[in-house]
């Protein structure tokens, strides 16, 4: 049987991705993060 | 508020075709997502679903009936207009239209329904 | 077509104890979107059908919290919680996944 007709079950949000590095000083190395919506998930 | 009636004969003979208004109010044919279909129950029995259009156009029938029957629509008059070609005894049923909108922020499903005509076929 | 099959086709329930309606489709009803279209309508005497239950388990506005779907594939239920008098008539499954959209036999519950 053909389907029936119904939106795709997803909704597409755009954010903006920043990826940054902190240098954190000469023994610590560098800190890498994710940050999404303004928010650091990484 | 949101509704819908249906209006036709009340008995046609057999061979003849029958055409069907379902004039709605509370929404709009031209909204995105929006559609209208129709469904039938004859005495005692139950439901069938018979067509569906949406606001785009589309259309969708149900195959086992699909060569008798046209569904269109005219926005302008919120109305939607089934006709059913070649009626026999066993077309005799209560005749119902109802509302379905796509969308995930949508019910997607028969929300609202007319309160049905009731069609005899007979000669 | 979606074989939709109903039972009990006859439901005597005493006010205030649960009942249950089971449907079962005979395939999948999945929609390749990942939402199951299967919908529950309750027909009381003499009226139009109206909504009670749409994707399996989502009540509509106005309906009683004491209805709810549930299940998954091909096996579904309805239950009431504590049946009312005013619950009387048929309930219809149905699924609108595929062409054509399609219904039970309906279950008629009655207050004993």
């Known amino acids: 049987d053909a389907e029936f007709r119904h939106d795709s079950g997803y909704e597409v949000h755009h954010q903006k991705l920043v990826f940054f590095a902190e240098d954190v000083g000469s023994n610590k190395g560098a800190i890498i993060g994710l940050m999404v919506g303004g928010v650091v998930i990484a | 508020q949101v509704t819908l009636k249906e209006s036709g004969p009340a008995l046609v003979k057999p061979t003849q075709t029958l055409t069907l208004t379902c004039t709605f109010s509370g929404f709009s044919l031209s909204t995105s997502g929006m559609g209208v279909g129709w469904i039938r129950q004859p005495p005692g029995k139950a439901l069938e679903w018979l067509a569906h259009i949406w606001w785009d156009d589309d259309k969708s029938y149900n195959p086992s009936l699909k060569s008798r029957l046209t569904i269109s629509k005219d926005t302008s008059k919120n109305q939607v207009v089934l006709t059913m070609t070649n009626m026999d005894p066993v077309d005799t049923a209560t005749y119902y239209c109802?509302?379905?909108?796509?969308?995930?922020?949508?019910?997607?499903?028969?929300?609202?329904w007319g309160q049905g005509t009731t069609v005899t076929v007979s000669s | 077509d979606v074989v939709m099959t109903q039972s009990p086709l006859s439901l005597p329930v005493t006010p205030g104890e649960p009942a249950s309606i089971s449907c079962r489709s005979s395939q999948s009803i999945l929609h390749s979107n990942g939402n199951t279209y299967l919908e529950w309508y309750l027909q009381k005497p003499g009226q139009s059908p109206q909504l009670l239950i749409y994707k399996v388990s989502n009540r509509f506005s106005g309906v009683p919290d004491r209805f709810s779907g549930s299940g998954s594939g091909t096996d579904f239920t309805l239950k009431i919680s504590r049946v009312e008098a005013e619950d009387v008539g048929v309930y219809y499954c149905s699924q609108a996944s595929r062409v054509p959209l399609t219904f039970g036999q309906g279950t008629k519950l009655e207050i004993k």
């Open positions: 109802a509302r379905r909108q796509l969308g995930l922020r949508s019910i997607d499903a028969m929300d609202y």
